[in-house]
């Protein structure tokens, strides 16, 4: 029925999304400017909207010619399919006066058997199938071609490839008479990149490989595939990067043991176990060396396959990531928090940081939170004074005519920045939390007297009295 | 026009048996995942059973489990549910749903079928 | 299982004022950008009718004065101005997961 959200089927299926690239439309300029700069010192965010606003002032009327949307592709390799068998794609906005080139992969979950991909067709079918996926996507975000929204990137050509194979990017199996359905989310991304090479992809100077939640840890699982396939096609110069953000998981123990029946239940170790064998899923060579037959399931958590990696890897991950408390069967419901929880995501967070310490270009902030990168409100968070965008370009700038991250961080341009403040939302640039049961916004002194912290306890180390701490805490300072 | 039509019901013996059924039409039903929703006289809505879309898994309540079975053809556009074991808590409007695949939740309502446990 | 906890029970509405019921989750029904909880209507001797999907999306043919919102675990129904024919039973009911459940129901009445 009408009124629904534009990816849901309309009754009537609409005609194939176009397999080819559409011809400049009359009357549009087919030469663009492009205004590529790697790095700018100063205040970036102003500086950007001025060459912004000049840029599009030497096209008349150019304010009807600025289309956010990027456009659908479906795959012109049909056999490369989504889970029910329907073609793979991806979204573009090129632009073409750019040698940057980022390319996004989508999360949602997984399923790991035939039940809970069952179910998972049956309410959530466009993360299984590009059958009702809309014509066009709007970039948000670090895919915004917005410099007040993107301030890091918003000039590069942008690529959204949607999540369809619900196996963490991994798969390479095909849909049979024996599988039900198909997990080819690795071959998916090899095949996007085959395809835009078509489209100017191969002019290319960087590629960022960047992903949420599952597109995050497939950012992990596929960046150095993506540069080997690029070296064999004849590409060696094209530098391949990546960007995880909430894919740095934990093998952890659950704070409450539970049985692996659903997605959301399962720990972490059992559901990527069951999972690997049932997508027949594909992790990075190297690091497959490193562990026997069988326990290649290692590979999907972070800490473990990016000592492996060759490409540089920007790691963004809240400390207490949401969804890594789901999978640890913690659900912060109304009630305060017993000691035990409370001590059980204290812990949780110090172990996350831990794995990050040799990880020298990484982000990671005090909150409880889950994604980032494509929010339109990215670029206010901080940590230690410096913004995501900001530590992206210094990354940028870190790695400026090498593949490797140089050892001595450039002064004043951080890359290394991870929240060492103890407790959830302790940083004040978190994004704002709502109690969970009234949906009413609470500030940080509300919300971490609701985890259960006494404020004697926390303001101790700090060298405060607890009503200094609170009357801090409430200003945002 | 999208239509769900349940029968079957009627009065029953403890410990009886009887099969419901529900037949659709004016949509592809091999497309959408099935559910039985039941309503005891003056209650509130209870979720009973799930088929996929394909057939292929079933899932129910922990109040059913055991004494129910859920299936379909799809070949005939009808859902099944068969049940053995009757109590009188069972007795219930028993209504068929359709589940949109794009969030699960129930677009399409039968008018329901009334089943009786009694002695 | 996710419960749902559906507030008040009943509630009396004068005509053209607002009504608001509210459901609680027993954890988070949202994922990937969309929260899986959806509102029904059901009258005497009917089957429930949907009023809005995905916490939020009015369903074709559903006047406007319905409204849904909320996220993780609290989600609350809308009826502003109240009229007559709302006079019904409201129930909440997600599908993030199986088994799937509804909340107990609330009963309006406009005075």
């Known amino acids: 029925s009408e009124g629904r959200k534009t990816w849901r089927r309309r009754g009537q299926q609409p005609p194939p999304p176009p397999r080819t690239e559409a011809a400049p439309a009359a009357g549009q300029p087919v030469e663009s400017f492009p205004l590529d700069f790697t790095a700018v010192e100063g205040n970036m965010d102003s500086f950007m909207a001025q060459v912004k606003s000049l840029a599009q002032s030497l096209y008349p009327c150019s304010a009807q010619q600025l289309n956010e949307d990027l456009r659908l592709h479906l795959l012109l390799n049909t056999s490369v399919t989504c889970n029910d068998g329907s073609p793979a794609g991806y979204y573009l906005k090129e632009s073409r006066g750019s040698r940057r080139w980022l390319l996004f992969l989508e999360g949602g979950w997984y399923c790991f058997n035939r039940e809970n991909c069952d179910s998972r067709y049956d309410t959530m079918r466009r993360l299984m199938s590009s059958r009702d996926w809309p014509r066009t996507r709007t970039g948000t975000g670090i895919l915004s071609s917005q410099p007040e929204e993107n301030p890091y990137w918003w000039n590069a050509n942008m690529v959204f490839i949607p999540y369809c194979s619900s196996d963490v990017w991994s798969g390479a199996s095909p849909k049979s008479d024996k599988n039900e359905y198909a997990f080819m989310g690795s071959l998916i991304i090899q095949e996007v990149v085959r395809e835009l090479l078509g489209k100017g992809l191969s002019g290319a100077k960087v590629l960022l490989l960047a992903g949420s939640s599952a597109g995050g840890t497939g950012v992990l699982l596929n960046v150095d595939r993506v540069a080997e396939l690029l070296e064999e096609l004849g590409y060696p110069s094209i530098q391949v990067r990546g960007l995880a953000d909430s894919g740095w998981f934990l093998d952890n123990k659950q704070y409450r043991r539970s049985d692996c029946i659903d997605t959301i239940n399962c720990a972490p170790t059992d559901a990527i176990r069951r999972g690997i064998r049932y997508w027949s899923g594909m992790v990075p060579e190297r690091c497959q060396r490193q562990f026997k037959e069988g326990e290649e399931w290692n590979c999907f958590f972070g800490y473990k396959v990016y000592p492996t990696l060759r490409c540089p890897v920007f790691v963004v991950q809240w400390l207490f990531d949401e969804a890594q408390l789901t999978v640890d069967n913690v659900h912060l419901t109304g009630q305060p928090v017993q000691e035990g929880l409370r001590l059980y995501i204290q812990n949780l967070g110090r172990e996350l940081r831990h794995t990050l310490k040799d990880v020298p270009a990484s982000f990671a902030p005090a909150c409880l939170s889950h994604e980032i990168i494509i929010r339109s409100h990215w670029t206010d968070v901080q940590v230690k004074g410096t913004s995501l965008p900001r530590a992206l370009h210094c990354w940028d700038r870190s790695l400026h005519d090498s593949h490797k991250a140089s050892k001595t961080p450039l002064k004043g341009c951080p890359v290394h920045l991870v929240d060492s403040c103890p407790w959830p939302h302790c940083n004040p640039s978190c994004p704002t939390v709502r109690d969970q049961f009234t949906g009413q916004e609470m500030n940080v002194a509300q919300f971490l007297m609701h985890m259960g912290f006494d404020m004697q306890t926390v303001a101790q180390p700090q060298g405060l009295e607890p009503s200094e701490l609170l009357g801090m805490l409430s200003n945002g300072s | 026009d999208v239509q769900l039509l349940e029968s079957g019901g009627g009065l029953v013996q403890p410990g009886g048996s009887r099969k419901l059924s529900c037949a659709a039409s004016?949509?592809?039903?091999?497309?959408?995942?099935m559910h039985w929703v039941r309503q005891a006289p003056e209650k509130g809505l209870e979720w009973v059973a799930y088929?996929?879309?394909?057939?292929?898994?079933?899932y129910y309540a922990d109040t059913v489990k055991g004494r129910l079975t859920l299936s379909r053809d799809n070949s005939k556009n009808t859902l099944f549910l068969e049940m053995t074991s009757l109590r009188s808590e069972d007795t219930a409007m028993y209504y068929c749903a359709r589940a949109s695949y794009d969030g699960g939740y129930f677009d399409c309502w039968g008018q329901g079928t009334s089943l009786t446990v009694s002695s | 299982d996710i419960v749902l906890t559906q507030s008040p029970a009943s509630l009396a509405v004068s005509l053209g004022q607002r009504a608001t019921i509210s459901c609680r989750a027993s954890k988070s029904v949202s994922t990937s950008g969309y929260s899986y909880i959806h509102w029904y209507q059901q009258k005497p001797g009917q089957p429930p009718k949907l009023l809005i999907y995905l916490a939020s999306d009015l369903e074709s043919g559903v006047p406007a004065r319905f409204s849904g919102s909320g996220s993780g675990a609290a989600f609350t129904l809308n009826i502003h101005p109240v009229e007559e024919e709302d006079a019904a039973t409201y129930y909440c009911h997600h599908s993030r997961e199986l088994p799937f459940t509804f909340g107990s129901g609330t009963k309006l009445e406009i005075k």
């Open positions: 088929s996929s879309s394909g057939g292929t898994t079933v």
């Open positions: 004016g949509f592809t039903f091999s497309d959408f995942g």
